[in-house]
């Protein structure tokens, strides 16, 4: 075949996804390597081709887009898994070409398993909260594009193994989790489980991030914004929170 601009294996994009969950993976060419987008390329008569190399194999092979229930499909510059399987792990290549032009890049995809407390080999994003700085929020990450705005998903938030409910200072609000006043005891891993329907099937997305409570911006105590729990000094609130956590450990261990 004619020469192709090969950007090699883009290890900066080590994509990790959970087993048995939907995954949408954009071809990195348009995001990081080329100066034009998919629509422009498509209008110019360029075709996007996908193939892959299985884990521990050298052979490049086409992706099977004829699986039952269209488990793997391509939509514009996105490769869809509905859902992933463990043996989808491998290096994926997207190639943009026509008779006179060719450019391609490969990237690794790792399908990982989670345990009953959402622990996994997944590398977790870290979200910093400022200690005692008033209301701050985290948002369930990387769920855009999985379902249209007309679909209203259900969301459950967890801290570690524990469903977040009746926490003193942490309030689930759909895709957001609000910290009324961030305390050191709020350090930990937070998981959102998003459930949504699509074409007569139900899918689940699991997203975990690490919350790190740090000193206020600019040093000092910062200036807390008005807050419904201001009447409770932070140590008192912390005592309540710790006592509740002990109670949850006794009554709701490994709550799913």
């Amino acid at each position: 075949s004619e020469r192709c601009d090969d950007w090699g294996l883009d290890t900066m994009r080590q994509i990790q996804v959970f087993e048995d969950e939907p995954a949408r993976i954009k071809c990195p060419l348009f995001e990081h390597f080329l100066k034009f987008n998919y629509s422009t390329a498509h209008s110019a008569g360029l075709t996007l081709i996908w193939y892959w190399t299985r884990q521990d194999r050298d052979l490049e092979e086409p992706i099977n887009f004829r699986l039952p229930e269209n488990r793997i499909s391509k939509e514009k510059d996105v490769l869809w898994f509905r859902p992933t399987l463990l043996n989808d792990t491998g290096n994926y290549t997207c190639m943009l070409r026509n008779t006179t032009y060719c450019s391609k890049v490969a990237f690794p995809l790792e399908v990982v398993q989670k345990d009953s407390c959402f622990n996994s080999p997944m590398k977790l994003p870290v979200h910093k909260l400022y200690i005692e700085y008033g209301i701050q929020r985290i948002t369930c990450p990387n769920v855009d594009g999985y379902f249209p705005s007309s679909v209203k998903p259900t969301i459950t938030w967890y801290m570690g193994c524990y469903k977040i409910q009746n926490f003193n200072n942490v309030i689930p609000e759909g895709m957001n989790l609000s910290f009324l006043i961030a305390l050191i005891s709020n350090n930990g891993n937070y998981t959102c489980v998003v459930t949504y329907p699509e074409n007569g099937r139900t899918f689940h997305l699991t997203r975990t991030l690490t919350v790190k409570v740090v000193g206020s911006p600019g040093g000092g105590s910062g200036k807390p914004i008005p807050n419904p729990l201001l009447g409770l000094d932070s140590t008192g609130l912390n005592d309540i929170f710790e006592a509740q956590k002990i109670e949850w450990h006794e009554h709701h261990h490994h709550h799913h």
């Epitope: 048995d20 969950e21 345990d115 469903k163 009746n166």
Partner: antibody
């Protein structure tokens, strides 16, 4: 499609133990919880417990601790429930049901296994 | 344990009629509630989860609602295949607990 196939009816003596199965197909067995539910003849539903086959983590309702033991075999995608020290009140239909974290904890149910305890 | 009080325990209704069944929890269950239908000799079928979400394949005449401690299941226009026993389940906390059931029969 997702299916849970439960093993056939069991007849057991008082004091004996019985172990029955729930074979999963059509989905990734290790990614979902398996729930177990008891229904005595003419009575309502009673939750026994749950297991996450991915790591074997279990939860039981207090009443069934020591009575029911939940296990899972990943290689065969099969969940098991063992009942020990059988008594007449253990005569019932036992259902397995698949569930996920948080939102949809019961979606697909097995057809049930009938256990009869009789001397 | 959270106690789920379901009412009525049995009811008669005509085909085409609007039917409502209620479930009251002994404490706030944060919409972690499912509804099931069990027909004689069959395993239960999940209808609704998280109080108001219809399971795929369940007819749209079924709807759920409620919050806090009080929840309801409504059938907008009763059909023959809807007859059976309806159960609610709370899964807000362990142990999960079912309501005692509502037997729905033809008037």
């Amino acid at each position: 499609q997702v299916q849970l196939q439960q093993s056939g009816a069991e007849l057991a003596r008082p004091g004996a133990s019985v172990k029955f199965s729930c074979k999963a197909s059509g989905y990734t067995f290790t990614s979902y919880w398996m729930q177990w539910v008891k229904q005595r003849p003419g009575q309502g539903l009673e939750w026994i417990g749950t297991i996450y086959p991915g790591d074997g983590n279990t939860r039981y309702t207090q009443k069934f601790k020591g009575k029911a033991t939940l296990t899972a075999d990943k290689s065969s995608s099969t969940a098991y429930m063992q009942l020990s020290g059988l008594a007449s009140e253990d005569s019932a239909v036992y259902y397995c049901a698949r569930g996920y974290f948080g939102n949809l904890v019961f979606d697909v149910w097995g057809a049930g296994t009938t256990v009869t305890v009789s001397s | 344990d959270i106690k789920m009080t379901q009412s009525p325990s049995s009811m008669y209704a005509s085909l085409g009629e609007r039917v409502t069944i209620t479930c009251k929890a002994s404490q706030d269950i944060n919409t972690y509630l499912s509804w099931f239908l069990q027909k004689p000799g069959k395993s239960p079928k999940t209808l609704i989860y998280r109080a108001d979400r219809l399971v795929d394949g369940v007819p749209s005449r079924f709807s759920g609602g409620g919050s806090g401690q009080d929840y309801s299941l409504t059938i907008s226009s009763l059909e023959y295949e809807d007859l059976g026993i309806y159960y609610c389940l709370q899964y807000d906390e362990f142990p999960y607990t079912f309501g005692s059931g509502t037997k729905l029969e033809i008037k």
